[in-house]
Interface confidence: low
């Protein structure tokens, strides 16, 4: 058969949950402390909450059925009677009472024909303000007749016909009634919720609803023009040219900011947005949803997309509607011919209307932003240049911030890219130019996207002119080749000498993509004599071991994930892992990761790695322990860092000396 409507699916779920209590029993969730009841969907059933409020489960006869004394469940179908009597069956006795008062309407409800009545519950009538009720029942009851006729349709309409966004023609001056049928099974009629649906009568059908509904006369634009509280909004809509859309056909939800909402925004921000047509349009579009959303449809958190493209979390807390968790809706369900308006008392400024400063204010990067300000880079972050700001998280500076000197200023300039980027378009190997004139490289890994040593820690925030990338560390642009990095650091004098003697200098100086696990002098000194002697005994072996320390791609710590098997230049794979923010290679911790070079990255280690084939095994022809001498000499040689040192002859002499 045809696909079931959401309402029918929810009813089916309720029936399923109630079946252990007998035939045609439906499980109903009642919000504690209220009379609000809901047929229950799967999610609500397990959460036992509606709008964050606890519910109790009760079991009632499903629509159209009744109990039989002495029998389990609700085995009997309700007897069919006319519409007037069916009003009593569904408990809408006040509607019966008012029908009697009109004199004309009861004969119609009891006579031939086929009608649909959206009958307000007794509570709905009781909750009408006294002056509204008085006006309905005065004027020789003509207003009451008109009001009741507006609740009627001149044919039988069942819930499976009630489609989202459709309009029905009422029996009062052919005025439209707006129907919304939401994916969660809730059906609304002019934003009044269907409580009990599809109660058949001999001459039609009755649906019980939770409000008295009234005719809709104005479109969204007209409501904005009428209401004093929308004076600022009115001007903004006119300036943006959105009034045409808001008075046209369609079904929209306008989250309409009141004058008070605009007043909460600092003058500088508001003036900037109001003076920028694109930002203004984005701001207003961020308050418009693509379809009509009645408050009654919200029973839990729901992600909705605005016309601007931002996702808002619409939810509820008790009787209050919330947006992004805040109860900022002050007046809900103001119906228009082309949608529904909810008054909000806070402006929803989208990222696309914000400066980089404003984007950063809502991110966890305030420390970095203060540094940019102090370094005199504030203009770039609030102007109309197309830029991308690479802003490290506050946690990066937990041990303090650097002093603002020339070096820091330059470093910060290299955190600003001269283009407005989106991370989804970045690709591996791409280079990005900074305000400081540096070229930064992009590295794309399975679970991360990094720019040099720093990886993106949160979704981009794309502003009016600039985009904010929240980064997981301070970015350090490369200052030279791997060889330059090693030569410039006293900790690696022995490694430099070893690299030179193994003939790998050129490799680590030329263009390329290398990950070098660089053992410190201490690492070499800590080698067991046997390993040291083996390492030094053979230039080829030395080259082999050194190549095992060099990966054939750039792997920064942010790209490791849990475990990466990195192919070395020697051929075997290195097991690189990250646990509790500590990088390890072959299960040995890295002392200092991510020293960037133009042709790679250096990770400092305090041990020398052994390739699988070299892992210690007993050999009879052990070299003498005095091999340590080579490192004493290498250390001295390499301090003269500008000279190229050839150690092959030194090896020969040492090996001669080591023979017994």
């Amino acid at each position: 058969g045809p696909a079931k409507s959401p309402y029918q699916l929810v009813l089916q779920h309720s029936r399923l949950r109630g079946r252990q209590h007998g035939p045609n029993v439906c499980a109903v969730q009642k919000v504690i402390g209220t009379n609000r009841k809901y047929f229950t969907n799967c999610k609500q059933w397990y959460q036992r909450k509606i709008c964050g409020k606890s519910t109790v489960i009760s079991y009632e006869c499903c629509p159209g059925y009744e109990k039989v004394p002495g029998e389990k469940g609700c085995p009997a179908a309700l007897p069919l009677s006319n519409l007037y009597e069916t009003l009593g069956v569904v408990g809408s006795t006040t509607t019966q009472l008012y029908t009697d008062r009109t004199e004309k309407l009861r004969p119609e409800m009891e006579g031939p024909g086929s009608f649909t009545i959206f009958a307000p519950s007794n509570e709905a009538w009781a909750s009408l303000p006294a002056e509204v009720l008085d006006s309905l029942v005065s004027n020789v009851n003509i207003e009451l007749l008109n009001a009741l006729r507006y609740h009627m349709v001149g044919r039988r309409v069942l819930t499976d016909e009630l489609k989202h966004g459709m309009t029905l023609t009422s029996m009062y001056q052919n005025s439209n009634i707006q129907i919304h049928h939401y994916p969660n099974g809730i059906v609304t009629v002019n934003c009044a919720r269907l409580l009990k649906a599809d109660h058949h009568a001999t001459n039609g059908v009755v649906h019980l609803i939770d409000k008295v509904i009234s005719t809709i006369t104005n479109n969204i634009q007209q409501i904005i023009e009428i209401e004093d509280t929308f004076e600022t909004l009115r001007a903004a809509v006119a300036a943006s040219g959105l009034n045409t859309m808001l008075e046209g056909n369609g079904q929209y939800t306008l989250l309409a900011p009141t004058n008070e909402a605009f007043e909460k925004i600092p003058s500088e921000t508001l003036n900037r947005i109001l003076g920028d047509p694109e930002a203004l349009r984005d701001l207003l579009n961020n308050h418009i949803l693509k379809s009509a959303m009645c408050a009654e449809a919200i029973v839990a958190g729901l992600s909705v997309e605005t016309l601007e493209g931002t996702t808002l979390e619409v939810g509820c807390s008790g009787d209050m509607l919330t947006i992004n968790g805040k109860a900022i809706i002050s007046n809900k369900d103001i119906l228009a011919t082309n949608g529904v308006i909810h008054y909000i008392d806070e402006l929803l400024i989208p990222d696309s209307a914000k400066t980089l400063f404003e984007l950063a204010a809502e991110s966890d990067v305030s420390t970095a932003i203060d540094l940019f300000r102090q370094a005199g880079l504030g203009n770039h972050l609030s102007g109309s240049e197309r830029l991308t700001l690479l802003a490290p998280l506050n946690s990066v500076f937990k041990d303090g911030t650097p002093p603002i000197d020339a070096h820091t200023r330059n470093l910060l300039r290299n955190h600003i890219i001269k283009d407005q980027l989106a991370s989804k378009y970045l690709y591996h190997g791409q280079t990005l130019e900074t305000l400081g004139g540096k070229k930064l490289r992009v590295f794309v890994y399975r679970n991360s996207l990094c720019i040099e040593n720093s990886c993106i820690a949160a979704h981009d925030k794309r502003g009016r002119y600039g985009t904010l990338f929240t980064m997981d560390r301070v970015l350090t642009p490369p200052m030279g080749t791997v060889m330059d990095v090693l030569k410039g650091d006293n900790r690696f004098s022995m490694l430099v000498a070893a690299i030179q003697s193994a003939g790998l200098t050129e490799t680590l100086n030329r263009e390329g993509v290398y990950t070098v696990f660089a053992p410190t002098n201490e690492a070499f000194r800590a080698l067991p004599p046997r390993e040291r002697s083996r390492l030094l005994g053979d230039a080829k072996e030395l080259a082999n071991i050194l190549k095992y320390h060099i990966g054939d791609e750039i792997l920064v710590s942010g790209g490791i994930g849990a475990l990466v098997r990195l192919k070395s230049l020697q051929g075997d794979k290195l097991e690189v892992s990250l646990k509790n923010n500590v990088v390890s290679v072959n299960k040995e911790p890295v002392a200092e990761p991510d020293i960037m070079a133009t042709n790679g990255v250096v990770h400092v280690i305090t041990n020398v790695l052994q390739p699988p084939a070299n892992r210690p095994q007993e050999r009879g022809d052990e070299l003498a322990d005095s091999a340590l001498e080579i490192f004493k000499q290498a250390s001295a040689f390499s301090r003269a860092s500008q000279r190229s040192v050839r150690l092959a002859p030194v090896y020969q002499k040492l090996l001669e000396r080591m023979k017994h």
Epitope: P266, S267, E268, N271, E362, G378, N379, S382
Partner: antibody, heavy 120, light 113 residues
């Protein structure tokens, strides 16, 4: 370094006009919001008006609205304040002030001040 | 407009001692979206232009000694000078930049006791 050098003192009669200037150097003038703040003799500070970085927007204190005009000339990096329909209560030291950056509105750098005396 | 009220009008403190002055705004200067307070403090010595000390209610301007600190949020703010130096005796103004017209407090005169 940032410098804001203001024109000299002026003595004017009530109802007359005067134009005070402020020459900026040491920074990109067109990248900053600029302000005028005044201080009547023995009194506190009072914001007079603001002009945006591009000179498109100007905002004034209610007391001076319609009488004072702020303009800027990016080619000469000069800020102006034209005071017309002068009153005795306009007697004050007028300070030219540079904002922190393109939007943020606190007063980061101040000129030396220009004394305007309105007396019959 | 937002009215800024400073207290006391005059504060007499000995050099080396701590000075604390208050500033109250007639409405909150805390902007919820960025959790920043739009308030600045200035120092003015006789015959001189004012000088920026603090912005965002608590961020010291570059070059301002660490003995100056700002605190507070919403409508109540404080400027504290931890150990007064002779050059600190001056008039101090708070200023809001949350809404036009930008307004100053009437000033607190810090004098030698």
């Amino acid at each position: 370094q940032v410098q804001l050098v203001q024109s000299g003192a002026e003595v004017k009669k009530p109802g007359s006009s005067v134009k005070v200037s402020c020459k900026a150097s040491g920074f990109t003038f067109s990248d900053y919001y600029m302000y005028w703040v005044r201080q009547a003799p023995g009194q506190g500070l009072e914001w007079v008006g603001t002009i945006s970085d591009g000179g498109i927007y100007a905002y004034y204190a209610q007391k001076v609205q319609g009488r004072f005009t702020i303009t800027r000339d990016s080619s000469t990096s000069t800020l102006y304040l034209e005071l017309s329909s002068l009153r005795s209560e306009d007697t004050a030291v007028y300070y030219c002030v540079r904002g922190w950056d393109r939007y943020d509105s606190w007063f980061a750098c101040w000129g030396q001040g220009t004394t305007v005396t309105v007396s019959s | 407009e937002i009215v800024m009220t400073q207290s006391p009008a005059t504060l007499s403190v000995s050099p080396g001692e701590r000075a604390t002055m208050s500033c109250r705004a007639s409405q909150s200067l805390l902007y919820s979206s960025n959790q920043k307070n739009y308030l600045a403090w200035y120092q003015q010595k006789p015959g001189q232009a004012p000088r920026l000390l603090i912005y965002w209610a608590s961020t010291r301007e570059t070059g301002i000694p660490a003995r100056f600190s700002g605190s507070g949020s919403g409508t109540e703010f404080t400027l504290t000078i931890s150990s007064l130096q002779s050059e600190d005796f001056a008039v101090y103004y708070c200023q809001q930049y949350y809404r036009y017209p930008y307004t100053f407090g009437q000033g607190t005169k810090l004098e030698i006791k």
